[in-house]
């Protein structure tokens, strides 16, 4: 009989009897092995993905996910209903709309169903894992002679967004920074008319709704400057 | 690229110990998504495995019973390396001994050089 | 455990020829199958993984198909160097790892 005894010391003589457990296929082994930890994102609370890594477990195992809403009228179990896979093993879970509920506890359950004592619980606050999509629609307006206006659109309630606009000319190696309430607009008070200037916004779900610490991806980037239209210096320029 | 070097001696006297180590680059033994294995070839039981550890928040260790009470395989995170000790060592245990990484898909695409171990006073 | 068990045990071939070895799980294994090759006094080699992903670096003649308990590794065009043991190996279920007892292409 060719099967294995697995140990979380090495010393399998001395802790055998506290750390083993029957297994399927004539095996033993321990019940201690750690799932691996589950990631949540909230994208611009449309869907969510719960997703883990796969590759940690020591043989292929489609790791099931269970979830709940804790102290709430959704406090039922539900199974996933849309797993993510990544080369044929489960990899994670998509949940939709109708079943986020940003500001109750999200109790996600993940267990291992070879062996269903292995399983590991996370609550998680999905208010703080809110990825807003990025900014759109970038404008331009020139307010006066040396005064530019930047502003942007988000396919969210404005008033739960930070944003975050960086800029350069084509003279600078590095980005200028600036953090922008929830009013989604940005001036720039002083511009050389003999530079061209590249702005882009990014976005977070904080700090009035929620406490993200995850920004959007980058805005397109959108461009202002000595190669825009001389006959009318009112007009803007965006480029992808 | 991940590369394994095995070393340690070729000729074990019986009931004796069989110790040898297989040292990591490109890698880490304390990687979260590998695992470390010694496997061995014999003519009259072919690739045989013999066990393998890997880290997963802390160590783990799968041993055949095949070998099981005899066996032990430590990691050495501060050399990236990790052994192999057989200890009462008979003919029977004479063969080509491995090392190799548990990587992609659950395969094993890395493998160190092969020891010949001979058991003989 | 889950016993491998490959066909034939030896086979002899041309340069030239187009080869095919099989390899039976004792139960089902998805398609967690891998190949390799070992040449004497050499470790042995990934070629295929996961039934049939060909390990980078391996020449596009190896292939390898098969899910469940049947699979195949084929070779397209026999070639000198391919003259060597091929072994099958499970990792669907483990501990323990098992191998299959290997085929030994000679040439003819």
């Known amino acids: 009989l060719n099967t294995t005894i697995l140990t979380p010391n090495g010393n399998e003589d001395t802790t055998a009897d506290f750390f083993l457990t029957t297994m399927p296929t004539d095996s033993l082994s321990v019940s201690t092995l750690p799932l691996p930890e589950v990631q949540c994102f909230v994208f611009n609370v449309e869907y969510m993905n719960c997703t883990w890594n796969s590759s940690s477990e020591p043989q292929p195992t489609n790791l099931t996910l269970h979830y709940w809403y804790k102290n709430s009228d959704n406090d039922k179990v539900q199974k996933c209903s849309h797993y993510l896979f990544s080369e044929e093993i489960t990899s994670g879970c998509q949940l939709q709309k109708k079943e986020i509920h940003l500001y109750q506890t999200f109790v996600v359950q993940l267990q291992d169903p070879r062996e269903p004592r292995r399983q590991a619980t996370q609550m998680l606050k999905l208010q703080n894992l809110v990825i807003p999509w990025a900014p759109e629609n970038l404008t331009l307006h020139k307010l006066s002679e040396s005064q530019l206006e930047l502003n942007w659109n988000n396919r969210f309630l404005n008033h739960c967004l930070e944003h975050l606009v960086q800029y350069r000319t084509d003279w600078d190696h590095s980005w200028t920074e600036q953090s922008v309430d929830y009013r989604h607009k940005f001036s720039l008070p002083s511009v050389d008319g003999q530079k061209r200037y590249t702005f882009r916004v990014r976005s977070r779900f904080n700090p009035l709704c929620g406490s993200a610490q995850h920004w959007s991806e980058w805005s397109h980037p959108i461009h202002w400057g000595s190669n825009t239209s001389k006959e009318n210096p009112f007009l803007f320029a965006l480029e992808a | 690229q991940v590369q394994l070097q095995q070393s340690g001696p070729g000729l074990v006297k019986p009931s004796q110990t069989l110790s040898l180590t297989c040292a990591i680059s490109?890698?880490?033994?304390?990687?979260?998504?590998a695992a470390w294995n010694w496997i061995r070839l014999s003519p009259s039981r072919g690739l045989e495995w013999l066990g393998r550890t890997f880290f997963r928040s802390t160590w783990f260790y799968d041993y055949s019973l095949s070998v099981k009470g005899r066996i032990t395989i430590n990691p050495d995170t501060s050399k990236n390396q990790f052994s192999l000790h057989l200890n009462s060592v008979t003919p029977e245990d004479a063969a080509v001994y491995y090392c190799a990484r548990t990587g992609r898909r659950w395969s094993l695409d890395y493998w160190g050089q092969g020891t010949l171990v001979t058991v003989s006073s | 455990d889950i016993q491998m068990t490959q066909s034939p045990s030896s086979l002899s071939a041309s340069v030239g020829d187009r080869v095919t070895i099989t390899c039976r799980a004792s139960?089902?294994?998805?398609?967690?199958l891998n190949w390799y090759q070992q040449k004497p006094g050499k470790a042995p080699k990934l070629l295929i993984y996961a039934a049939s992903s060909l390990q980078s670096g391996v020449p596009s003649r190896f292939s390898g198909s098969g899910s469940g308990t049947d699979f195949t590794l084929t070779i397209s065009s026999l070639q000198p160097e391919d003259f060597a043991t091929y072994y099958c190996?499970?990792?669907?279920?483990?501990?323990?790892?098992?191998f299959g007892q290997g085929t030994r292409l000679e040439i003819k």
């Open positions: 139960q089902s294994i998805s398609s967690y």
């Open positions: 190996q499970q990792s669907y279920s483990t501990p323990p790892i098992t």
């Open positions: 490109g890698d880490s033994v304390s990687s979260n998504i």
